[in-house]
Interface confidence: low
């Protein structure tokens, strides 16, 4: 039977899926708080615009009896069960917010393609790319891949005079949901990253990684991995590392590197950290005070999802347009809206754009310093520190293949 949308006559509802299986282990109460804070802001913005309408959220919980792994492994069926719950209740909002696991979003997209926009905090995998009614508010794997290819090819910076064409990727299967899909994209033989590299090998065992660090016969000096500094230390410890090894540590949702009192441990000196530029006001906001850095990004994406809906609702109501139309479902892309801590830009496919930051450890100060930034919206790198105090010879990044001359 047709599911009616509670989405007209001045009353607009958001369906928020509260799934037990989630990209990040965030208490659902915190996500509710984020959504409710978003609703307050949206109501205020609509009121200020002279739009006297009601905006509410319905939280749809799964029973948690069957799908209780807590991570994304059993999320596919949980997502579909929640859709059936909505279907049986004959009640659907104007928009669906919630699925964060790539598995569940991909499957649910097959079942929501007809009518509704879907906003996700997560869904990092390549299989969720180019979905016409899906919006992703946390950086998807495609954005990471484009940065890496751009950076690999760069050879005209004072600190990077070689273009690279090789890499090892460390992926042992214990990664968090975001890292799993980021590395999955790098591993995929058909991906842009694989297509652009001449050599790429995935290291799956700790020992493989450890051996490469001093292996004279290694095929690349560059190793990509995903996680925080502690994750790297557990793997690398205090082992010696060849002087021309470069470890790229992908740790997007962690703004601890930018805190004043942080000192980089010694084992980070051969490491470039890729993270996201921290939000303007987020570190001090009341909303984020009880959240760890990663969870702050996750809950923030829920909050921004509400603000995005409010932004679109305002535009459509001001233009006298119907909300329950394909036009509305397709509209959540190629725009900038006012997010919780500043403007948020979505690309042509509804994926969030951001500023990625590549950090290095200064051998002088033992602090993390910004080497360069990368704007995912224009696929462009901007050098910041033209004379970095690197651990690498001549304060330049080494060639990716030992013994190979200038490119």
């Amino acid at each position: 039977s047709q599911v009616s949308q509670n989405c007209h006559n001045g009353s607009y509802e958001i369906s928020v899926l509260m799934m037990g299986n989630s990209a990040f282990a965030e208490p659902l109460k915190n996500l509710e708080d984020a959504v409710n804070e978003g609703l307050e802001i949206v109501r205020g913005r609509l009121q200020n615009a002279g739009l006297n309408v009601t905006v509410n959220a319905t939280f749809m919980y799964s029973d948690g009896l069957i799908h209780n792994s807590g991570d994304c492994r059993s999320s596919t069926c949980e997502g579909l069960d929640l859709l059936r719950k909505i279907s049986n209740a004959q009640r659907m909002g104007c928009v669906l917010i919630g699925p964060s696991c790539t598995y569940s979003t991909f499957q649910m997209y097959l079942d929501t393609e007809l009518s509704y926009p879907m906003i996700s905090a997560g869904s990092f995998g390549l299989s969720c790319d180019y979905k016409e009614t899906l919006t992703r508010l946390m950086s998807p794997a495609r954005k990471l891949m484009y940065f890496l290819v751009n950076f690999w090819k760069t050879n005209d910076l004072p600190f990077k005079t070689y273009s690279w064409s090789t890499s090892y990727v460390y992926k042992n299967g214990t990664e968090t949901e975001d890292c799993f899909w980021y590395l999955n994209a790098l591993e995929a033989s058909v991906s842009y990253f694989s297509h652009e590299l001449g050599f790429k090998v995935v290291l799956r065992q700790d020992k493989e990684f450890q051996d490469i660090l001093m292996d004279h016969n290694r095929k690349s000096n560059v190793i990509i991995m995903c996680g925080g500094p502690e994750f790297l230390y557990k793997l690398k410890g205090d082992r010696a590392v060849a002087e021309d090894i470069v470890i790229i540590l992908v740790d997007l949702f962690n703004d601890q590197y930018f805190e004043d009192n942080v000192t980089a441990p010694d084992y980070m000196k051969n490491v470039l950290v890729l993270t996201l530029s921290p939000g303007n006001s987020l570190l001090n906001s009341s909303f984020s005070r009880n959240l760890s850095p990663t969870k702050r990004d996750f809950a923030l994406a829920y909050l921004n999802g509400i603000l995005l809906f409010g932004h679109m609702l305002k535009i459509f109501l001001e233009n006298g347009e119907n909300i329950t139309t394909p036009k509305f479902a397709h509209a959540f892309r190629n725009l900038t809206f006012e997010g919780y801590d500043g403007p948020v830009t979505l690309d042509d496919w509804g994926d969030v754009d951001s500023t990625m930051v590549l950090l290095y450890t200064s051998v002088d100060t033992k602090k993390y310093k910004v080497l360069l930034t990368y704007d995912t919206h224009v696929n462009k790198t901007y050098p910041v520190d033209m004379s970095p105090t690197f651990t690498w010879k001549n304060s330049k990044l080494p060639n990716d293949i030992t013994g190979r001359g200038p490119q």
């Epitope: 097959l110 393609e113 394909p326």
Partner: nanobody, 121 residues
């Protein structure tokens, strides 16, 4: 390649019922029913999402027609009740080969040959 085959069409009196069946060689993404009356453009009738959870109908058939699917049998159905003379048309089933949004016929990749439904008054 995906093959679609419609069946169940025929001649029926106004107010009567028919059940159309569409069998496919592969069933995964959204499927739909369209119809084309003589001298008119092909028009959307109903569609059903990949998992069968969501359905959507043209205003002209809402409340009278019911679309459903059985993925275990790779089959989609259109139950047509309270048929009217203006429902007379060739009915086509269609299927997508990728997840894609949109009710227009151009958003469907595979088509059957059609089955004739004639409603007499």
């Amino acid at each position: 390649d995906v093959q679609l085959q419609e069946s169940g069409g025929g001649l029926v009196q106004a107010g009567g019922s028919l059940r159309l069946t569409c069998t496919t060689t592969f069933s995964s993404y959204a499927m739909g029913w369209f119809r084309q009356a003589p001298g008119k453009e092909r028009e959307f009738v109903a569609t059903i999402s990949g998992g069968g959870v969501y359905t959507y109908y043209a205003d002209s058939v809402k409340g009278r027609f019911t679309i459903s699917r059985d993925n275990s049998k790779n089959t989609m159905y259109l139950q047509m009740n309270s048929l009217k003379f203006e429902d007379t048309a060739v009915y086509y089933c269609a299927q997508r080969n990728i997840p894609r949004y949109g009710l227009e016929s151009r958003n469907y990749d595979y088509w059957g040959q059609g089955t004739q439904v004639t409603v007499s008054s």
